[in-house]
């Protein structure tokens, strides 16, 4: 599931990561819009390990994947905010 | 070349355990996630454990999870599989492979194989 | 979990054939699929990944292709060689292979 979220919590991540995830082992994507106490945007993943990981947004893959995931739920959701299982 | 030299299959009881190894040589062992895959006598291939390149992340399916570990050691360019309490069902020839490039944004799957090792359970 | 049936299970074809395997997912796997090859005895081989994609080395006659929940693995013409057994594997939510495809000598 890819989610976006507008929360009025403070930043979520502690230490991010930009160690690449294969999409296969992904359960879901959180994405945290920067604002609202919080001057950056947040990715978190949730691994089909059950761990949990926050992404550095700058990371290639990941910007890669975000933009796959937009292109494919753009035709069929609103934007920003969308939930959709990793196609 | 890339090569890849299992170890440590043999006969054990049910319940019994196993810890098998894959010795890997001609690439960057610590720079690529790596897998085990099995095969029990004339089936089909089916997926154990996967592990990311740096060691801290596992990822098994439902029928080993619980009893089977995988771990590696990059200082020693080796990969492992603990197998605790074996079936009759894990019965199998134990492929250790070459996995997705942990450094990269691709989703390549499992590459490289080994020729695989043995392991009879059996009473 | 996903699901891969492939067919058909077996198949006997003549040197020169062409021969069509196909694998249908139980949900959409996004071209995330691979195509071994194995001998008896062997390790299996790695021929295509993301449902078309060529690994290095692999001769041209074999192609893959497909979308959404269906996949198809050709090879334009048998070469003796070829005679084994074929796995699809899909990799886009964990990992599942087909049942497998034996390929023999008609």
């Known amino acids: 599931v890819l989610e976006v979220y507008y929360t009025s919590l403070r930043c979520r991540c502690v230490q991010e990561s930009s160690v690449f995830i294969p999409r296969r082992f992904i359960d879901r994507i959180q994405i945290l819009p920067r604002g609202n106490g919080c001057p950056r945007k947040e990715i978190i993943v949730w691994k089909k390990n059950k761990s949990i990981v926050c992404v550095d947004p700058q990371a290639e893959w990941i910007q890669r994947m975000m933009e796959v995931l937009r292109k494919r739920s753009s035709s069929t959701l609103p934007v920003p905010v969308f939930k959709r299982k990793i196609p | 070349e890339v090569q890849l030299v299992e170890s440590g299959g043999g006969l054990v009881q049910p319940g019994g355990s196993l810890r098998l190894s894959c010795a890997a040589s001609?690439?960057?062992?610590?720079?690529?996630?790596m897998s085990w895959v099995r095969q029990a006598p004339g089936k089909g291939l089916e997926w154990v454990a996967t592990i990311s390149d740096g060691g801290s992340d596992a990822y098994y399916p439902d029928n080993v999870k619980g009893r089977f570990t995988i771990s590696r050691d990059n200082a020693k360019n080796s990969l492992y599989l603990q197998m605790n309490s074996l079936r009759a069902e894990d019965t199998a020839v134990y492929y250790c492979a070459r996995d997705y490039y942990g450094s990269g944004y691709e989703d390549s799957p499992m590459d490289y194989w080994g020729q695989g090792t043995l392991v009879t359970v059996s009473s | 979990d996903i699901q891969m049936t492939q067919s058909p299970s077996s198949l006997s074809a003549s040197v020169g054939d062409r021969v069509t395997i196909t694998c249908k997912a139980s949900q959409d796997i996004n071209k995330y699929i691979a195509w071994y090859q194995q001998k008896p005895g062997k390790a299996p081989k790695l021929l295509i990944h993301?449902?078309?994609t060529l690994q290095p080395g692999i001769p041209s006659r074999f192609s893959g292709s497909g979308s959404g929940t269906d996949y198809t693995f050709t090879i334009s013409s048998l070469q003796p060689e070829d005679f084994a057994t074929y796995y699809c594997?899909?990799?886009?939510?964990?990992?599942?292979f087909g049942g497998g495809t034996k390929l023999e000598i008609k």
């Open positions: 001609g690439f960057t062992f610590s720079s690529y996630a």
């Open positions: 993301y449902t078309s």
């Open positions: 594997l899909q990799y886009d939510n964990l990992y599942t």
